[in-house]
C-alpha cells in the first residue's frame, strides 16, 4: 500500500463504492496536498484490468486507509 503526495486531483468524481477484493492487485492512497484537497484511494486491478478510484467515504476505503495507517505509523 504505497503512500505519496502529488499535485492536482487524479480521480474524476468520488469513485466506486467497492471493488472485489479478489480483483485487487494494490491500493494507493494519496493524501490531501496543496492542489488536491481530498484523500484519493486508487485501486490497481489484477490482470492489467486498469485502475479504479474507490470512494474514500466507503466502508472498503476506510478499511484500506486504516490498514495503511496502522502499517505506517
Amino acid at each position: 500500500f504505497p503512500m505519496f503526495k502529488r499535485g492536482r486531483c487524479l480521480c474524476i468524481g468520488p469513485g466506486v463504492k467497492a471493488v472485489k477484493v479478489a480483483d485487487i492487485e494494490k491500493a494507493s492512497i494519496m493524501y490531501p496536498s496543496n492542489n488536491c484537497d481530498k484523500i484519493e484511494v486508487i485501486i490497481t486491478l489484477k490482470e492489467n484490468k486498469g485502475q479504479r478510484c474507490l470512494n474514500p467515504k466507503s466502508k472498503q476505503a476506510r478499511l484500506i486507509i486504516k490498514k495503511v495507517e496502522r502499517k505506517n505509523f
Epitope: C11, I12, V16, V19
Partner: nanobody, 118 residues
Framework: EVQLVESGGGLVQAGGSLRLSCAAS????????IGWFRQAPGKEREGVSC????????YYADSVKGRFTISSDTAKNTVYLQMDSLKPEDTAVYYC???????????WGQGTQVTVSS
C-alpha cells in the same frame, strides 16, 4: 494497446449543443469506467464527468450538472458526452480518460476542441 480517441468538438454559439464521442480500443469494455476532463487555456484541468459500469454510476462536476449527460454504447465501445445549454466558460479541449483517472500530461490523447462563442 489502450487507445481512446475523442471527437465531436466544434464551434457553437452559447446555448447550443454538441455531442462528444470517446471511442475506446485495446481493453475489454465489459467492466469499465470512462471519464471526461477538460483543459482551458491558462486554467487548471477539470474533471467533468465519469461513467462506471460496475456500479452503474455517473458523476458530474457542479459546473456542468443539469447540462451535460454521459452515456455509453458497449456494442460500439464508445462513451458519449452530450453537452447542452453550452456557455462560453465551457470552452476548452476535452479529453476522455480510462478508469476515470486523469493520466500524466504526456499521455493525454489529442482531445477535441470545444469553442463556445457569446
Amino acid at each position: 494497446e489502450v487507445q481512446l480517441v475523442e471527437s465531436g468538438g466544434g464551434l457553437v454559439q452559447a446555448g447550443g449543443s454538441l455531442r462528444l464521442s470517446c471511442a475506446a480500443s485495446g481493453f475489454t469494455f465489459d467492466d469499465y469506467a470512462i471519464g471526461w476532463f477538460r483543459q482551458a487555456p491558462g486554467k487548471e484541468r477539470e474533471g467533468v464527468s465519469c461513467i462506471s459500469s460496475s456500479d452503474d454510476s455517473t458523476y458530474y462536476a457542479d459546473s456542468v450538472k443539469g447540462r451535460f449527460t454521459i452515456s455509453s454504447d458497449t456494442a460500439k465501445n464508445t462513451v458519449y458526452l452530450q453537452m447542452d445549454s453550452l456557455k462560453p466558460e465551457d470552452t476548452a479541449v476535452y479529453y476522455c480518460a480510462k478508469d476515470c483517472i486523469i493520466p500524466p500530461i504526456g499521455s493525454w490523447g489529442q482531445g477535441t476542441q470545444v469553442t463556445v462563442s457569446s
